[in-house]
Interface confidence: low
């Protein structure tokens, strides 16, 4: 699968989610550490099992399914609660059904995600990889009643599709709450007026409204009676109300924080996995960075340092010890433009983190223009151009004519080598996967290819040209302020 | 724009002030090229003749032009055949291409922006009383996939394809009156890509009413086919 | 303000078929729907059908698979195709559209054509 999956099928022992909490809520061991308890599973003694950082893992075939090491000396190991797998049924909205159907109610085949044809469409499986968006099955990754598909036929746009419903018990959904806890997904309080005083109508009613916001279509969302519920991400929990001229309102319902707080006060919060806008912000070139910005400029989270999956690396705590490595933060343990990290993307490698520079005032400063070297090829060339045989050449293209993605010159798969590594040309440059040109090579920048079949390749740098205005490129960064 | 905030001076050098003739400013425009500046057909509804219009590019001031700016004629307009809301407007010269005035980039054609993905806005237009009168705005915000905007408690259907959405459902940012014709630019990689031109809205940053842009890379092929023609 | 003028309204026998169109025109404006009400003697307005800018279409029960709307935004027209009538349709039809000014707040404003009479006879 290209993505983590977070449930279990049967027993889990092919579980490679990364829950690391035992049922009782322990903290679990590292996998690798022998305190408080020396483990007789571990990465070492059972390599193919998965024993990453403190996830929990199944390495013994135990029925009861995936454990841990607990980090409480009292308790040697503890089950993990782990969601099933939904590939049969769907529990709930279907939001993490994770099935093979792809036909629609009225039996239409669906169109795949990472297609455009016949319909245009936003879901791009790229941006979304924990929305498991696979081929063309029909999947829930907006909050719609049940799992749906964009069909194949042009004049169907989309449509929801038919999934049985589970027949075990639905996941819990974490704790509930008789107050106000953010948007009061998890208010499970017995207010049932509007912030107007509109007595609320019975989500099982139709009437004076009809609504499809029933406790048949939303059935985790414990719609009884006619309790103020927010089952759809709305602001705040809501009701339709018993007054026919007003359709729905927002009710009032006491803050978890004591004070009570009206819907006015009600912080709109940005609707789930919204990148947040990171407020904090690097000097220089952010080697000095220590924040938690965890997010990449597309809005990708951050692997672990620490971790190998899902792409393995060399810039580990270990080998960077000053670099603050410290979870799965933005870091820039190379000298680097900026802060970047691995992305828990399998289909990107890294990116740069959605961080701003820090300016001193909130004066714009204009940047120079970028200075033009003359063709000297020793000279190494930061921009994504070459002067050359591009000798000196340090951007960031890491991609071979082909397409190909480059592998990174430290690693030694798929291709082992000894020739050009970090360790044997420290002054090359070969930094991360970028393409270089440690041997003068007539052809230009090169790397060794992530395919196994194909040892190096040619990467596609053009010469550098004078200065000149590139669109969509302004010389004074822009401010970029939250929309709210 | 309503809500975001004041940009920094030139940090959006693609932005164009469509004016009167005698100087007024009423709707925003992308220079896409040194030549070509992308606007909304509705704000050319006033006249059809290119000299009841200028455009102004390099400001950050609505009113006090700085003395870098550039002040060009039309001389042409190019209404989109199929009455969308898109048009192109030929400069009489083209302008001089600096570091406070640099065009836009269009995407590739029928490029599609995925939901949620983050962009913005700018513009000299309405502000509702949220500050920054004046001066180009700028305001983050989020695109919004159109099966989740045409729903019943948000525009309810009234989007089309060659359409797109973008605001926060809670409301309180957006582009208003006299943002219209003006960009939502999308950072790719390592530059802004044009993909939509301020078209309409129901009101301004009202809740569960987000903006509708006309989605241009359905219309790259006819912006290129005009400037290539002409 | 909006104007809409409507045609295609007449004396029909029962099973026949009628097209009904309706162009809007004024200031500068943008639809965001079409539709047509009808009203027979003695009852009220009731929606026929409406569709959307964006193509949604909506049918009142007792028409649904003999009467079908169709819109050409270039146009800014509606048409309303009325197949296998009966005398129950026998009522005067109103145009109605939604537009948002473009100079204007954004608001929505409804507007209403005079009516085009549908006579069918048994």
């Known amino acids: 699968k290209v993505y983590l999956s977070e449930c279990k099928t049967g027993n889990g022992k092919n579980y490679r989610g990364t829950m690391s909490k035992t049922k009782n809520g322990i903290t679990c061991q590292k996998w690798s550490s022998t305190s408080p308890h020396r483990p007789r599973f571990s990465p070492a003694t059972h390599p193919s099992e998965g024993l990453e950082e403190n996830y929990c893992r199944n390495p013994d075939n135990d029925p009861q399914g995936p454990w841990c090491y607990t980090t409480d000396p009292e308790k040697r190991y503890d089950y993990c609660d782990i969601l099933e797998c939904e590939e049969e049924c769907m529990h709930c909205s279907g939001e993490n059904y994770d099935g093979k159907i792809s036909k629609t109610m009225s039996g239409l085949e669906c169109q795949a995600w990472d297609s455009q044809s016949p319909h245009a469409h936003g879901y791009i499986p790229s941006k979304f990889p924990n929305k498991n968006l696979k081929k063309n099955y029909c999947r829930n990754p907006d909050r719609e009643l049940r799992p749906w598909c964009f069909t194949t036929d042009p004049n169907k746009r989309w449509e929801l599709c038919d999934i049985p419903r589970c027949t075990t018990p639905p996941p819990s959904s974490g704790p509930t709450y008789q107050c106000l806890k953010g948007t009061g997904e998890n208010y499970r309080g017995n207010v049932a007026v509007t912030v107007s005083g509109h007595t609320c109508q019975h989500w099982s009613a139709q009437t004076p409204h009809t609504h499809n916001r029933t406790p048949e279509n939303f059935p985790c969302k414990n719609l009884d009676e006619n309790y103020c519920r927010n089952p759809d991400g709305k602001r705040a929990p809501w009701c339709h109300t018993t007054n026919s001229q007003v359709r729905w309102e927002y009710c009032k319902i006491p803050s978890c924080d004591s004070s009570p707080v009206s819907t006015e006060q009600l912080a709109p919060t940005a609707p789930p996995e919204l990148t947040p806008v990171v407020q904090d912000c690097y000097h220089g070139d952010g080697q000095s960075y220590r924040g938690t910005s965890s997010t990449t400029t597309t809005g990708k989270k951050c692997q672990s340092w620490s971790s190998m999956t899902p792409h393995r690396h060399q810039k580990t705590p270990e080998n960077y010890p000053n670099a603050g490595l410290t979870m799965n933060y933005c870091r820039n343990p190379d000298a680097d433009k900026g802060p970047w990290c691995f992305t828990t993307d399998p289909s990107v490698r890294w990116e740069y983190c959605n961080l701003k520079k820090c300016s001193g005032t909130e004066a714009s400063v204009v940047a120079p223009p970028p200075v033009v070297l003359l063709p000297d090829v020793e000279t190494p060339s930061e921009e994504d151009c070459m002067f050359g045989n591009g000798k000196g050449y340090r951007g960031k293209r890491a991609t071979t004519v082909t397409g190909t993605p480059c592998q990174d010159w430290a690693a030694q798969e798929p291709h082992r080598h000894s020739i050009f590594t970090p360790e044997t040309n420290p002054r090359a440059g070969l930094e991360k996967n970028y393409c270089r040109n440690p041997d003068g090579d007539v052809g230009g920048p090169w790397c060794y290819t992530t395919n196994p079949r194909k040892l190096y390749d040619y990467c596609d740098v053009p010469q550098c040209a004078a200065p000149s205005f590139d669109c969509g490129k302004p010389q004074v960064e822009p401010k970029k302020c939250p929309g709210r | 724009v309503v809500g975001g905030c004041v940009a920094h001076p030139h940090s959006w050098p693609w932005q164009v002030s469509l004016r009167t003739r005698f100087g007024m400013h009423f709707c925003g425009g992308t220079l896409i090229s040194p030549e070509w500046v992308l606007t909304a057909a509705h704000c050319l509804e006033k006249s059809p003749r290119p000299s009841s219009y200028k455009v102004i590019l390099g400001a950050h001031q609505e009113v006090n032009l700085e003395p870098h700016v550039q002040e060009i004629e039309v001389s042409r307009l190019f209404l989109e055949p199929t009455r969308k809301d898109i048009a192109l407007l030929k400069l009489s010269s083209p302008a001089v291409i600096t570091d406070k005035v640099i065009p836009a980039c269009l995407p590739s054609p029928n490029y599609v922006v995925a939901d949620r993905t983050e962009c913005f806005i700018t513009g000299w237009g309405e502000t509702q009383g949220t500050f920054g009168a004046g001066l180009l705005k700028e305001a983050q915000l989020p695109v919004i996939e159109n099966k989740v905007c045409n729903r019943y408690e948000f525009l309810n259907g009234r989007v089309q394809s060659t359409e797109l959405c973008a605001g926060h459902l809670a409301g309180g940012t957006d582009s208003c009156q006299g943002d219209s014709g003006g960009p939502l630019v999308c950072f790719e990689k390592d530059k802004y890509i044009l993909q939509g031109v301020t078209s309409w809205g129901l009101g301004c940053a009202r809740p569960n009413k987000p903006g509708v842009y006309v989605r241009v890379s359905r219309f790259v092929t006819w912006i290129e086919g005009v400037m290539r023609n002409n | 303000q909006v104007q809409l003028v409507e045609s295609g309204g007449g004396l029909v026998q029962a099973g026949g078929s009628l097209r009904l169109s309706c162009a809007a025109s004024?200031?500068?404006?943008?639809?965001?729907?079409m539709g047509w009400y009808r009203q027979a003697p003695g009852n009220q307005r009731e929606l026929v059908a409406s569709?959307?800018?964006?193509?949604?279409?909506n049918y009142a029960g007792s028409v649904k698979g003999r009467f079908t709307i169709s819109g050409d935004s270039a146009k800014n027209t509606v048409y309303l195709h009325m197949n296998s009538l009966k005398p129950e349709d026998t009522a005067v039809y109103y145009c109605?559209?939604?537009?948002?000014?473009?100079?204007?707040?954004?608001?929505?404003?409804?507007?209403w054509g005079q009516g085009t009479q549908v006579t069918v006879s048994s």
């Open positions: 109605t559209t939604d537009v948002v000014f473009r100079d204007g707040n954004g608001q929505i404003q409804s507007n």
């Open positions: 569709i959307t800018n964006g193509g949604t279409t």
């Open positions: 004024g200031r500068r404006f943008m639809v965001v729907a």
